[in-house]
Amino acid sequence: GITIPRNPGCPNSEDKNFPRTVMVNLNIHNRNTNTNPKRSSDYYNRSTSPWNLHRNEDPERYPSVIWEAKCRHLGCINADGNVDYHMNSVPIQQEILVLRREPPHCPNSFRLEKILVSVGCTCVTPIVHHVA
Amino acid sequence: GITIPRNPGCPNSEDKNFPRTVMVNLNIHNRNTNTNPKRSSDYYNRSTSPWNLHRNEDPERYPSVIWEAKCRHLGCINADGNVDYHMNSVPIQQEILVLRREPPHCPNSFRLEKILVSVGCTCVTPIVHHVA
């Protein structure tokens, strides 16, 4: 294993709250600028497990707007365009990090928070429980 | 209408880097404690657009481990268990926030970064381009 040496140019860490409280530069670096714009633009409509987009907005959080997927049907869309209830539309969930203002309404103090979001839906074969 | 007053208990903001650099409490509050642990554990295998999970590890990032979905097939699995190439398995992508150590190897100094991750796959009807 590699033990990375500490950079001598690091900010002072003698703060009584260290290492729980750290300095974070909020000038976000976006690594996605050159991605293919056609990426996943309308999958929510074209999927066999289509979903609607719910807007979750909170001014005390960054990002302040998070899009949540809500599966449109319990079943999946078949080749005829009908809902097939022998299959299930299920949300694909992911834990994401957000910044929560703490104390509330403070412009320069935050706490990391983990929240679970539904990103989209997928069609799965159901688990069938056989009753004895 | 409400204009939220600044909390008088906010940390000092006279820092020369303010407001770009802020204090963040890394003692993560997890809002997901009551979620069903079986959530989407095996959807990657049961989906009609199954995926594999690849481990993306970076010690200079928090979280240091991110799981990336890679669709197993170009097409989708049909009722017979075969790959149907008239449909497409596509990744559902999401932008997430991570913390990047800056300067590198510093334990208490970070920069916010947005990265794009594939969370899972869904089965979509292809877009057919007709050539005149």
């Epitope: 000038n27 907005e57 707007v65 | 992508q93």
Partner: antibody
Framework: EVQLLESGGGLVQPGGSLRLSCAAS????????MLWVRQAPGKGLEWVSS????????MYADSVKGRFTISRDNSKNTLYLQMNSLRAEDTAVYYC??????????????????????WGQGTLVTVSS | QSALTQPPSASGTPGQRVTISCSGS????????VNWYQQLPGTAPKLLIY???QRPSGVPDRFSGSKSGTSAPLAISGLQSEDEADYYC???????????FGGGTKLTVL
């Protein structure tokens, strides 16, 4: 200066095409969801299309679905609206605007201030024979 | 016809309090936050209220928004001549996967 500037409007015949552009400056464009909103002469505001900050999700009003395409180039700080199969009822002033929910506390963060919502000056599209 | 219903016009005298209604449904106002825009003649719209009741900096506290169920009124107290404009409510609609605007209310200061 923080601003949005639309261009590309003009007179076009029914069935024709136009491409609108919206150049952003003075803020971190790649962090914002963007919208196109239009206003027909003497009428109210109508949402046309939205695109997420990365360009990964696009949404359209039913009235333009299949005819209009929204896109963005974050490296050029520019939002686009490709309009095909134009109809007389598409005649309107077209505005680009930031999502009103992408607010934050100080422009020094690289984000806009609380509730700061940018609108361009608008570009007029006239569809007529 | 708009998914959000606003009265086409409203009026008041200087100093008066005026309320503009905006009613929708469970898929829009009932489940999402409401924004209000002011559009002065010949200009682009301006955000007046966001997240139901928040005022952007620079917007006078005479303007206030609220939300209850599927309706979200805008109140303007101490009416002034410069408030004469068109006012629009807007909200995301979960069912339509899109933004919906009210038809707009023309406010006249008598």
């Amino acid at each position: 200066e923080v601003q949005l500037l639309e261009s590309g409007g003009g007179l076009v015949q029914p069935g024709g095409s136009l491409r609108l552009s919206c150049a952003a400056s003075g803020f971190t464009f790649s962090l914002y969801d963007m919208l196109w909103v239009r206003q027909a002469p003497g009428k109210g505001l109508e949402w046309v299309s939205s695109i997420s900050s990365s360009g990964g999700v696009t949404m359209y009003a039913d009235s333009v679905k299949g005819r209009f395409t929204i896109s963005r180039d974050n490296s050029k700080n520019t939002l686009y609206l490709q309009m095909n199969s134009l109809r007389a009822e598409d005649t309107a002033v077209y505005y680009c605007t930031t999502d009103p929910g992408n607010y934050y506390d100080s422009s020094g963060y690289g984000w806009l201030g609380p509730g700061v919502n940018l609108w361009g000056q608008g570009t007029l599209v006239t569809v007529s024979s | 016809q708009s998914a959000l219903t606003q009265p086409p016009s409203a009026s008041g005298t200087p100093g008066q309090r005026v309320t503009i209604s905006c009613s929708g449904s469970s898929s829009n106002i009932g489940s999402n936050t409401v924004n209000w825009y002011q559009q002065l003649p010949g200009t682009a719209p301006k955000l007046l209220i966001y997240s139901n009741n928040q005022r952007p900096s620079g917007v006078p506290d005479r303007f206030s928004g609220s939300k209850s169920g599927t309706s979200a009124p805008l109140a303007i107290s101490g009416l002034q001549s410069e408030d004469e404009a068109d006012y629009y409510c807007a909200v995301w609609d979960d069912s339509l996967n899109g933004w919906v605007f009210g038809g707009g209310t023309k406010l006249t200061v008598l």
